[in-house]
């Protein structure tokens, strides 16, 4: 018996299986959303091109007290190489406009759907 | 108890200028980064500048740029909006916030109407 992406799993999660992961963690917020995700909380929108994974971490770890994403920001984490700690934005990382989490969620969840759709797993 | 206690606002012709004040409490001040976020009549919220907790940079949405300047005082733990050049389209409810903590810990809002 496999628990992927759990204690139990033999071996490295395939990137397939860790990207599908992610999408169904951010379907079941979106749905799931009662009141306003994370009291309306508002971070730095990302681009979703190179270093998105970082990136979108770096953006969401600075949210703290927020039950709903922590297990999106620990998946993040396992897409981003380097650790990454609140506070703490990449070159990559252009600050021009905040969004609340919700739409960030649904603008991440969008973009790694077309990724999963072409192949796209790392 | 973290509070943000908002003050300025009111009514303004097309042009004209206001300053909107934030006086926070509560909480290291000097330590953190704060945002003004504006919702408009009938309309989401829309983040409008951000200040780095030693107010050395600044950020602001594209529609206030060149006419907002946020700044900080920490030694009075206080929290500004120079709004200038002010437009209809700058109608709205002003909230300070702590940034990344939602409506927890937000300003009571104070309302900006532009209008002649």
């Known amino acids: 018996l496999t628990c992927l992406g759990g204690f139990a799993s033999p071996g490295p999660v395939p990137p397939s299986t860790a990207l599908r992961e992610l999408i169904e963690e951010l379907v079941n917020i979106t749905q799931n959303q009662k009141a306003p995700l994370c009291n309306g909380s508002m971070v730095w929108s990302i681009n979703l091109t190179a270093g998105m994974y970082c990136a979108a971490l770096e953006s969401l770890i600075n949210v703290s007290g927020c039950s709903a994403i922590e297990k999106t920001q620990r998946m993040l984490s396992g897409f981003c190489p380097h650790k990454v700690s609140a506070g703490q934005f990449s070159s990559l990382h252009v600050r021009d406009t905040k969004i609340e989490v919700a739409q960030f969620v649904k603008d991440l969840l969008l973009h790694l759907k077309k990724l999963f759709r072409e192949g796209q797993f790392n | 108890e973290v509070q943000l206690l908002q003050s300025g606002g009111g009514l303004v012709q097309p042009g004209g200028s206001l300053r909107l004040s934030c006086a926070a409490s509560?909480?290291?001040?000097?330590?953190?980064?704060m945002d003004w976020v504006r919702q408009a009549p009938g309309k989401g919220l829309e983040w409008v500048s951000t200040?780095?907790?030693?107010?050395?940079?600044?950020y602001y949405a594209d529609s206030v740029k060149g006419r907002f300047t946020i700044s900080r005082d920490n030694s009075k733990n206080t929290l500004y909006l120079q709004m200038n050049s002010l437009r209809a389209e700058d109608t709205a409810v002003y909230y300070c916030?702590?940034?990344?903590?939602?409506?927890?810990?937000w300003g009571q809002g104070t309302l900006v109407t532009v209008s002649s």
């Open positions: 509560g909480f290291t001040f000097d330590r953190e980064e």
């Open positions: 916030a702590k940034a990344y903590t939602g409506f927890r810990y």
């Open positions: 200040i780095s907790p030693n107010g050395r940079t600044t």
